[in-house]
Amino acid sequence: RTVAAPSVFIFPPSDEQLKSGTASVVCLLNNFYPREAKVQWKVDNALQSGNSQESVTEQDSKDSTYSLSSTLTLSKADYEKHKVYACEVTHQGLSSPVTKSFNRGEC
């Protein structure tokens, strides 16, 4: 099939989850091909490593594309120390990285 660049979305942790003491920020990549995509997390512009997990769906039966979710997991205390959360996505169908972000407390 032909190249499809991902659509990228970022989701802050829910209030319910924050009450439990943890914070998961999710970066979702939808409907891309080929399968290889890279997600980098930045918190207040500082690159994060080691505290995220990725899950890739199998190819969609209709259009043979993939989806991927990358989850950045922090303690509630660490989450509340910072303001800007961003995921940066590279894929061969993108001429430059796509960054999606939010400011904590403003969503």
């Epitope: 080929p34 290889e36 995509a37 890279k38 590279t90 894929h91 061969q92 169908g93 993108l94 001429s95």
Partner: nanobody, 120 residues
Framework: QVQLQESGGGLVQAGGSLRLSCEAT????????MAWFRQAPGKEREFVAI????????YYSDSAKGRFTISRDNAKNTVYLQMNSLKPEDTAVYYC?????????????WGRGTQVTVSS
Amino acid sequence: QVQLQESGGGLVQAGGSLRLSCEATGLTFSGVAMAWFRQAPGKEREFVAIIRWSGSTTYYSDSAKGRFTISRDNAKNTVYLQMNSLKPEDTAVYYCAADPSDRFGEYDYWGRGTQVTVSS
């Protein structure tokens, strides 16, 4: 210093063909994916085709599939884009780009582009 130099653009009638070339200098060509993008006036730069280091894996955009063919000569550090059945909507500046990761679209190097104009 890495340089990508495109050539082969020009003016062609609809239905005609062109072969673009991109020569890489100062770049270790091994392990590097090479891609073509294009940008029409007033539009965003869009992906056209890519060829991975081995040369056996190629991908195309919907608009290029079946009409364009990407190839590479690793001995000459050159990538090619053979464009057939050209249409007026293919008119754009065509850029080559190098992805040293070979897979993740980390386009660290770009050429300056070559103009392709397709007249009706």
